[in-house]
């Protein structure tokens, strides 16, 4: 909501999760792994990489089925705590200028830092308009105090807020699982909010920094070449 059409393939780590239709976003973090939101879990997912217009075959797409879909063991569907999911692709993505991985964070998100949010979600705060072309939004990371004041009692240490307290610009339905990137690092995963782009109701995002060890351990445990002793 309130964003702009991204320059074609300018978000090369952005993926679309498809089950006959786009339902969530995700981020490519290595040639064979994608991170998304825990609440985007489905038993069968096709990962679509290199997408810009999801309704048109433009020649840069790679469609790869999910081989493994691993939701965080402490995911809570009621509170959306630990809202993170890993997908292992059935074959490695071909990395090029239009499809490439995003780095995991080396530090937690800092208030005031500009970030890029992207997705194919609803662009209206009231009503619905699902775009064909990838949308981008530049938005600041909010302080934890602002985040907690916006959603008293709902924000865990695994969540942070990004956006504008005045409303008007936000992620929305269909953006879930997609990336929040600051300084070339994946800081957030689109998770939840009260409505979209409402005043004093910024978007809430999964704090990827808290899951770096889990991500690395899960990838290691699900790689074919790890040794058994």
């Amino acid at each position: 909501v309130g964003g702009y059409i991204c320059e074609e393939n300018s978000v090369p780590y952005q993926v679309s999760l498809n089950s006959g239709y786009h339902f969530c976003g995700g981020s490519l973090i290595s040639e064979q792994w994608v991170v998304s939101a825990g609440h985007c879990y489905k038993s069968r997912i096709q990962v679509r990489l290199g997408e810009h217009n999801i309704e048109v075959l433009e020649g840069n797409e790679q469609f790869i089925n999910a081989a493994k879909i691993i939701r965080h063991p402490k995911y809570n569907s009621r509170t959306l705590d630990n809202d993170i999911l890993l997908i292992k692709l059935s074959s490695p993505a071909v990395i090029n200028s239009r499809v490439s991985a995003i780095s995991l964070p080396t530090a937690p998100p800092a208030a005031g830092t500009e970030s890029l949010i992207s997705g194919w979600g609803n662009t209206l705060s009231s009503g619905a308009d699902y775009p064909d072309e990838l949308q981008c939004l530049d938005a600041p990371v909010l302080s934890q105090a602002e985040c907690e004041a916006s959603y008293p009692g709902k924000i865990t240490n695994n969540m942070f807020c990004v956006g504008f307290l005045e409303g008007g610009k936000d992620s929305c339905q269909g953006d879930a699982g997609g990336p929040v990137v600051s300084n070339g690092e994946l800081q957030g995963i689109v998770s939840w909010g009260y409505g979209c782009a409402q005043k004093n109701r910024p978007g809430v995002y999964t704090k990827v920094y808290n899951y770096v060890d889990w991500i690395k351990d899960t990838i290691a445990a699900n790689s074919h070449h790890h040794h058994h002793h």
């Epitope: 006959g20 239709y21 786009h22 339902f23 969530c24 939101a37 609440h39 985007c40 309704e55 959306l80 979600g121 705060s125 009231s126 009503g127 619905a128 308009d129 699902y130 064909d132 709902k154 992620s171 929305c172 339905q173 269909g174 953006d175 879930a176 699982g177 689109v190 998770s191 939840w192 909010g193 009260y194 409505g195 979209c196 409402q198 978007g203």
Partner: antibody
């Protein structure tokens, strides 16, 4: 149980206004869009507009813009639809309908909407 | 606005037979499509949402399929209570929300 109860039938003269109420019970009123749909005799369903009871934001079909006003009173969990400058072709059954997608604490997965609860309908007859 | 077109306008079927109703969107609506049943003098009743998910309490003989622009509602074995008018509706892009013109399923 979850239900929507509408006000009774109305007979109006051309040029007059009508205000139909829709009282919700059995769920959190502010948590779901309320839509209004009408059906002229022997015709199909026609969407008129919707209100977000949480924010008060409205969306109207262009056809009714300037003639329809949708409001709500959250203290009594009631939505209202007022149609002004009535004409004979406004004779129809007017329905309120709840969108089952939750507006509050919304996860941002793609939500597939639908009208899961409908009012019983209010017949509005416009005749001179 | 997205135009929804239903066909046929009327479908004559014998009880126990299969009924296949079609709904076409003028542009892609993804899976944001619902089907309703309406009987004379009654409010519509939700049958299917998300193109293929049966609403609570709807019998298994009703099934929905399709995505994008082409959708189908199938009633596998028509019962006497299934003779009614059926409407499709898109939620992908609104305002305005749009309904198809309806398909009347009548006894042959």
């Amino acid at each position: 149980q979850v239900q929507l109860v509408q006000s009774g039938a109305e007979v109006k003269k051309p040029g007059a206004s009508v205000k139909v109420s829709c009282k919700a019970s059995g769920y959190t009123f502010e948590g779901h869009y309320m839509h209004w749909v009408r059906q002229a005799p022997g015709q199909g369903l026609e969407w008129m507009g919707a209100i977000n009871p949480y924010s008060g934001q409205t969306n109207y079909a262009q056809k009714f813009q300037g003639r329809v006003t949708m409001t709500r009173d959250t203290s009594i969990s009631t939505a209202y639809m007022e149609l002004s400058r009535l004409r004979s072709d406004d004779t129809a059954v007017y329905y309120c309908a709840r969108d089952f997608v939750l507006l509050l604490r919304q996860s941002r997965i793609l939500h597939e909407s639908a009208f899961d609860i409908w009012g019983q309908g209010t017949t509005v007859t416009v005749s001179s | 606005e997205i135009v929804m077109t239903q066909s046929p306008a009327t479908l004559s079927v014998s009880p126990g037979e299969r009924a296949t109703l079609s709904c076409r969107a003028s542009q892609s609506v993804g899976s944001n499509l619902a089907w309703y049943q309406q009987k004379p003098g009654q409010a519509p009743r939700l049958l299917i949402y998300g193109a293929s998910t049966r609403a609570t309490g709807i019998p298994a003989r009703f099934s929905g399929s399709g995505s994008g622009t082409e959708f189908t509602l199938t009633i596998s074995s028509l019962q006497s209570e299934d003779f009614a008018v059926y409407y499709c509706q898109q939620f992908h892009n609104w305002p305005p929300l749009t309904f198809g013109g309806g398909t009347k399923v009548e006894i042959k």
